[in-house]
Structures are given as structure tokens and as C-alpha cells.
Interface confidence: medium
């Protein structure tokens, strides 16, 4: 896998760590499959962050779909404990906020926020899983926490 | 079967505003932004904004920032647009709409409301 | 924002033909690109998204293809029921935009 020594670092909001994917299929949603048995799997859902069970069919689905936990957690999640938090002593905006959205060039497109410096607003953007800059954001308020007035 | 089912026409005074009521079905409501389109007669479409029912969270169209009000009941699962300020300029249709999983198209909408703007 | 042209607001074609209908974005949407179909008195209907997925239930004959700021939705081969306006969509960044449509007429 040409992705294996690959990390996708993606800021999130300030509860949490940032969250780094070190695969874009770690960003697809749970697929169960047409088949119909019963298999417990687990899966990394980007929304809360965390490796979450569902029940698999037995066939096709995706690669966001792991025999255990450990594997899941593995596979798509890194904590690491620096984080951007904005704090009362903090009043200018990073610099990254300045920075046009950019994509990124893997394909794992998933949906992020960055800060849109002609608007004054917090918009959505198709980032690709991978590379990028640091004005991308996993929820709209951390966005605003960040980067608005 | 997805169904977001939206209200009558309504017939509105120009200053006054109105609420547009979009009732979801058909799967869990929090997990889906709403959003908003208009369509005034014969011209194309425009996002007005959506709503993470989730949190209330809202993005907005800037043009639309301060016409439009987006909020959501959670025990109902109807998502709301009030319109304020109504002018001739705000008769349109205006649907709801829910898009895929990860923001790629929208593949449900209502069956739109004609709002007209009336002395 | 980005701004969606569709630089035909009219074009005709026969029972059979093929048609195809473009769209230029004002700046790279990286394939985030949505087709629908409207007919007089209906809601938009979802043909293509990701500029060549087809959603489920839409005929083969609609194909959409594009890259960048290039796209274009093609009906191999036309059918009466097609007569109606077809809009593209980025959902690449918000505001979503929509171009301005394209009125297909049959002869």
C-alpha cells in the first residue's frame, strides 16, 4: 500500500486531539454490504472521532471495516497531544486562517470547514484526506473558534 | 423511503415574514444537514444555507444572511426557514433538500412551497 | 464564489440523438460536480454527482464526464421524457452554486 507511511493530519475541534488519517478509506462510511449475515466488524467513523462496531453482511463494503478494535484503532486513528486552542490572550487569528483552501492531492474526499478570508466566513470544502494546509477544520465551530471575529 | 414533506403556497403582505416548515422521513434526521434552495419563476437555483439538526448549527449563503433563519425541531423532525422583511423580490419556490452521506448532490427534496410576495 | 456557466440556455436535438450539455466552473472543483434534471412543475432530480456517478435509478444512456473546471452531462441516445432543464451543481465549497440551466427542446 503506497499509503502505509502516509499520515493525513486533519485539526478537529478543541475537545479532542487532532485527528491524522493514516488512510483516506478511513474516512468512508460504514458499508454493510448487500449480503445478509451477521458479522460484528468495526469501523473508524470521522464524525465522532472514534472506532465504532456495525454489524457487516459478509460481502463487498468497503475498507473501513476492521475484525477488531485494536485493529481499527490501528489503522486510522494517532492521538498526539499538540492541539490549536484559542485562547482569551490569543486575539489575532493564526496566520493559517489567511490561507486559501487547498484540497490537498489525495482523493479521499470528505467534507472540512476553512476560514474564506473575503467572506469573513467559515465555508465547506472538499479536502482530500491528505497534505493541504492548516486552515482546515473538522467542524464549522472550531472554525469560527479559530478564524472568525 | 426518504420523504421531506414541505407545507401549501403561502400568500404573504411585502415587510411581513413566514415560516416554512420541511418534515423529514424515512431516516434519522440528526444525522443529515438540511438545506435550503430557491428558485424564483423561470430563473435557476440557489443555496440559501443548511442545518446540522444535530446541533442547530447553520452555514449560510451570505446573501442570504439576515433574510433567512434556519432552525430545526428535533422531536418533530421538521426543519424550519423563516423568511423576514419580505419583499416582491422573495416570491420564489423554495425547497428543502438532503444531500448524500458526504456532501456529493442532493438526491432528496420537497415538493417545494410557493412563497408570494403580495400587497 | 464559484461561479457555474452553462453557456447554452437552449439546445434542440431528435429522438435518438445524442446530446451533450456543459458546464464551466470558475475555478477547479476537483470533480465535485452534480447534475439534476427539472421538469415544469417538479422538484430537481439527481442524475449525476462526483461529475460521473450515476445515482441509483437514472438511466445509462445519462453519462456525465469532466475535470477541473470542464464538465459535461451526455444523453447517448434521447428520449422523449428527456424534455426538461438540466442544471449542474458544484459541491465542491460553499455556497453551493448552480449554473443557470439548460433547456433541452425536442424537434
Known amino acids: 500500500d503506497s499509503e502505509e507511511d502516509e499520515e493525513h493530519t486533519i485539526i478537529t475541534d478543541t475537545e479532542l486531539p487532532p485527528l491524522k488519517l493514516m488512510h483516506s478509506f478511513c474516512a468512508f462510511k460504514a458499508d454493510d454490504g448487500p449480503c445478509k449475515a451477521i458479522m460484528k466488524r468495526f469501523f473508524f467513523n470521522i464524525f465522532t472521532r472514534q472506532c465504532e462496531e456495525f454489524i457487516y453482511g459478509g460481502c463487498e463494503g468497503n475498507q473501513n471495516r476492521f475484525e477488531s478494535l485494536e485493529e481499527c484503532k490501528k489503522m486510522c486513528t494517532r492521538d498526539n497531544a499538540n492541539r490549536i486552542i484559542k485562547t482569551t490572550l490569543q486575539q489575532e487569528k493564526p496566520d493559517f486562517c489567511f490561507l486559501e483552501e487547498d484540497p490537498g492531492i489525495c482523493r479521499g474526499y470528505i467534507t472540512r470547514y476553512f476560514y474564506n478570508n473575503q467572506t469573513k466566513q467559515c465555508e465547506r470544502f472538499k479536502y482530500g484526506g491528505c497534505l493541504g494546509n492548516m486552515n482546515n477544520f473538522e467542524t464549522l465551530e472550531e472554525c469560527k473558534n479559530i478564524c472568525e471575529d | 423511503e426518504v420523504l421531506l414533506q414541505q407545507s401549501g403556497p403561502e400568500l404573504v403582505k411585502p415587510g411581513s415574514s413566514v415560516k416554512i416548515p420541511c418534515k423529514a422521513s424515512g431516516y434519522t434526521f440528526t444525522d443529515y444537514t438540511m438545506d435550503w434552495v430557491k428558485q424564483s419563476h423561470g430563473k435557476s437555483l440557489e443555496w440559501i444555507g443548511d442545518i446540522n439538526p444535530s446541533n442547530g448549527g447553520s452555514i449560510y449563503n451570505r446573501k442570504f444572511k439576515g433574510k433567512a433563519t434556519l432552525t430545526v425541531d428535533k422531536s418533530s423532525s421538521t426543519a424550519y426557514m423563516e423568511l423576514r422583511s419580505l419583499t416582491s423580490e422573495d416570491t420564489a419556490v423554495y425547497y428543502c433538500?438532503?444531500?448524500?452521506?458526504?456532501?456529493?448532490?442532493?438526491?432528496?427534496w420537497g415538493q417545494g412551497t410557493l412563497v408570494t410576495v403580495s400587497a | 464564489d464559484i461561479v457555474m456557466t452553462q453557456s447554452h440556455k437552449f439546445m434542440s436535438t431528435s429522438v435518438g440523438d445524442r446530446v451533450s450539455i456543459t458546464c464551466k466552473a470558475s475555478?477547479?472543483?476537483?470533480?465535485?460536480v452534480a447534475w439534476y434534471q427539472q421538469k415544469p412543475g417538479q422538484s430537481p432530480k439527481l442524475l449525476i454527482y462526483w461529475a460521473s456517478t450515476r445515482h441509483t435509478g437514472v438511466p445509462v444512456r445519462f453519462t456525465g464526464s469532466g475535470s477541473g473546471t470542464d464538465y459535461t452531462l451526455t444523453i447517448i441516445s434521447v428520449q422523449a421524457e428527456d424534455l426538461a432543464l438540466y442544471y449542474c451543481?458544484?459541491?465542491?465549497?460553499?455556497?453551493?452554486?448552480f449554473g443557470g440551466g439548460t433547456k433541452l427542446e425536442i424537434k
Open positions: 451543481q458544484q459541491h465542491y465549497s460553499t455556497p453551493y452554486t
Open positions: 433538500a438532503r444531500m448524500h452521506y458526504n456532501y456529493d448532490g442532493f438526491p432528496y
Open positions: 475555478q477547479d472543483v476537483i470533480t465535485a
